[in-house]
């Protein structure tokens, strides 16, 4: 009967999922730094939360090793495009690990949204969604990058976001 | 040894995931009401199911508090567009809660798909996918809205859908 | 006290998710066969892995019955389009089951990406993401198909991929 405490805890864990790492971070005015770094995110206000994951300078940080479904959406838009109709946007999720000096590409999309904007109507909107399962060791980080960052439209945290949960 | 029943149940739960709330709802002819309300969904036929979540007038309703990965895809398409290249489509997931009188935006995308129709062939297709983790209390509801609903193409439940599962 | 082994195993399972089926397969040079069959995938190298799911000729195969969140992303791109600017791309996830002779559509998207290529710059990029919850019995398979396959761009496994996990 020495299992008592663990037993109750296990039932509680199973029922509530309370210990399953999960996070949803939202876009904010400070997300776009223009510094060449990753996007930064809101972690507490509104819809944003961290449960069993940490946050550091734009990165979600694993506290527990395992497989995670990671995802990000970015809202793109503009009036015309910086490079004209040939503009390509790259939206990606990247891993930082102490075991390797450079960021590792995990999930990446390329889009050419500006072909939609013409001389008559140069306003356009587009969206990019990425999601997939990756393995993270304790302390490994995942960040979001968008090139060209100038085309990301932020508003209220619902249109551009970044999250993860253990599977 | 009073743990017996619960113990077996717990093993069964863990192994089968049978009690983890999940749902996948599919588009149907009745999905588009033209009334300004949310999209309606098929809950039983074909690929559609509800497990530990309820459905009411287009909404997935939480029976258990927690964090849920919610998602929706809508198939967009048309022959030309009502507002030409300026036509914008907004696809969103929204929360209804007794604690607040208005729907709360959770995950939203804006797209300008009509630039995909070329000079002669006015036919175009586009797709919008949303997914992210949100917290739901018991009784809170999530709905899908698309503006302009006229541009949603329904067929067989595989192209437009709405789902969730607890994480 | 006859529960000892199972008890420890259960705690271990709960804590590590080690027995929850999951997979992430990545695009490779051999993915596009041109044979009219499904896309083929890398299962071991780089980011690819299988945990509690099998792989066979492009298909993820369920070893355990239940509901799975299945997903795929394909990177599309080209210089112009094979059928001119009206080209439509269909990206889908399909189920193969011994109980039915034909593949069953699960999740499907249609896109007209070539409208993004203009007369000045005929290079275009687009991306298609699908994800949703479906039920799989033991031995049932899920495959990815893209029509027109010629428009899928492979590089390093980060832009086109296919995965699943039990929910």
């Amino acid at each position: 009967d020495g299992h008592g405490g663990s037993w109750e805890q296990l039932i509680q864990e199973r029922r509530s999922h309370q210990n399953n790492p999960a996070a949803h971070l939202t876009g904010a005015n400070s997300s776009l730094t223009g510094s060449g770094g990753p996007l930064l995110w809101e972690t507490q206000l509104g819809l944003a939360f961290l449960r069993g994951l940490d946050y550091h300078d734009g990165a979600l940080v694993a506290n527990k090793a395992g497989y995670y479904y990671i995802y990000s959406k970015v809202q793109l838009g503009g009036v015309g495009c910086p490079l004209g109709l040939a503009s390509t946007i790259t939206h990606g999720l990247y891993k930082r690990t102490p075991r390797y000096p450079e960021e590792l590409e995990l999930l990446v999309s390329q889009q050419s949204p500006c072909g939609r904007a013409t001389s008559n109507s140069r306003v356009w909107w587009d969206s990019s969604f990425l999601g997939g399962v990756v393995h993270l060791e304790v302390g490994e980080e995942v960040v979001v990058r968008v090139l060209d960052e100038r085309l990301v439209r932020l508003r209220d945290g619902t249109r551009s976001y970044f999250g993860a949960f253990m599977v | 040894d009073g743990h017996g029943g619960s113990w077996e149940q717990l093993i069964q739960e863990r192994r089968s995931h049978q009690n983890n709330p999940a749902a996948h709802l599919t588009g149907a002819n009745s999905s588009l009401t033209g009334s300004g309300g949310p999209l309606l969904w098929e809950t039983q036929l074909g690929l559609a199911f509800l497990r530990g979540l309820d459905y009411h007038d287009g909404a997935l309703v939480a029976n258990k508090a927690g964090y849920y990965y919610i998602y929706s895809k809508v198939q967009l398409g048309g022959v030309g567009c009502p507002l030409g290249l300026a036509s914008t489509i907004t696809h969103g997931l929204y929360k209804r809660t007794p604690r607040y009188p208005e729907e709360l935006e959770l995950l939203v995308s804006q797209q300008s798909p009509c630039g995909r129709a070329t000079s002669n062939s006015r036919v175009w297709w586009d797709s919008s996918f949303l997914g992210g983790v949100v917290h739901l209390e018991v009784g809170e509801e999530v709905v899908v809205r698309v503006l302009d609903e006229r541009l949603v193409r329904l067929r067989d439940g595989t192209r437009s859908y709405f789902g969730a599962f607890m994480v | 006290d006859g529960h000892g082994g199972s008890w420890e195993q259960l705690i271990q399972e709960r804590r590590s998710h080690q027995n929850n089926p999951a997979a992430h397969l990545t695009g490779a040079n051999s993915s596009l066969t041109g044979s009219g069959g499904p896309l083929l995938w890398e299962t071991q190298l780089g980011l690819a892995f299988l945990r509690g799911l099998d792989y066979h000729d492009g298909a993820l195969v369920a070893n355990k019955a239940g509901y799975y969140y299945i997903y795929s992303k394909v990177q599309l791109g080209g210089v112009g389009c094979p059928l001119g600017l009206a080209s439509t791309i269909t990206h889908g996830l399909y189920k193969r089951t011994p109980r039915y002779p034909e593949e069953l559509e699960l999740l499907v998207s249609q896109q007209s990406p070539c409208g993004r290529a203009t007369s000045n710059s005929r290079v275009w990029w687009d991306s298609s993401f699908l994800g949703g919850v479906v039920h799989l019995e033991v031995g049932e398979e899920v495959v990815v198909r893209v029509l027109d396959e010629r428009l899928v761009r492979l590089r390093d496994g980060t832009r086109s991929y296919f995965g699943a996990f039990m929910v």
Partner: antibody, heavy 119, light 111 residues
Framework: QVQLQQSGAEMASPGASVTLSCKAS????????MNWVKKRPGQGLEWIGR????????NYNQKFMGKATFSVDRSSSTVYMVLNSLTSEDPAVYYC????????????WGQGTTLTVSS | DIVMTQSPASLAVSLGQRATISCKAS??????????MNWYQQKPGQPPKLLIY???NLESGIPARFSGSGSGTDFTLNIHPVEEEDAATYYC?????????FGGGTKLEIK
């Protein structure tokens, strides 16, 4: 009620230009496409093109490129069509037709403007 | 351009009988289960009036004696029972591709 009021009959000389107007009322002007259609005596209907009042974007029938030019004045809910370099092929009745809610048909029409070209 | 061929060019139908007008497109005007085919009525000195949109949908305010059918390339307008006021020229029109094109018209005379 929806009404499209077109300008009165026009007479012009060969080589000249003429501006036809179509004033909309009874609905939200920017929410509907406006099309222009030509009807020559004893012949069928010909679609000239369309304008999207919300943006001013235009699409023309290749046959009328360089012949017709559309514009919009949102403040007065009016669309215009300029026909230039008039020839003997241009005399006709010109109609504006509003794009329907599902935008690929014309559900309301102006009464038409008769254009005569005479030297 | 998509060519719309209407037949017959003219027809005379007795009051109360059925008038059938055919329209053939040079290529399919279907998209995702919908047919982008419309029918208009035009009387002398008047603008055209929309009768049927998307091949078979009756425009608001149009009498139920008008009906449309067909898909792909072959379409039909039926009027039954024909009334005196139906004397007019009828046009089919496709809107799947630019330029929109009309059939040559069918002149209906009531006997």
């Amino acid at each position: 009620q929806v009404q499209l009021q077109q300008s009165g009959a026009e007479m012009a000389s060969p080589g000249a230009s003429v501006t036809l107007s179509c004033k909309a009322s009874g609905y939200t002007f920017i929410d509907h496409i406006m099309n222009w259609v030509k009807k020559r005596p004893g012949q069928g209907l010909e679609w000239i093109g369309r304008i999207y009042p919300v943006s001013g974007e235009t699409n023309y029938n290749q046959k009328f490129m360089g012949k017709a030019t559309f514009s919009v004045d949102r403040s007065s809910s009016t669309v215009y069509m300029v026909l230039n370099s008039l020839t003997s092929e241009d005399p006709a009745v010109y109609y504006c037709g509003r794009g329907s809610y599902y935008w690929n048909a014309m559900d309301y029409w102006g009464q038409g403007t008769t254009l005569t070209v005479s030297s | 351009d998509i060519v719309m061929t209407q037949s017959p060019a003219s027809l005379a139908v007795s009051l109360g009988q059925r008038a059938t007008i055919s329209c053939k497109a040079s290529q399919s005007v279907d998209f995702d289960g919908d047919s982008y085919m419309n029918w208009y009525q035009q009387k002398p000195g008047q603008p055209p009036k929309l009768l049927i949109y998307s091949a078979s949908n009756l425009e608001s305010g149009i009498p139920a004696r008008f009906s449309g059918s067909g898909s792909g390339t072959d379409f039909t307008l039926n009027i039954h029972p024909v009334e005196e006021e139906d004397a007019a020229t009828y046009y089919c029109q496709q809107s799947i591709e630019d330029p929109w094109t009309f059939g040559g018209g069918t002149k209906l005379e009531i006997k």
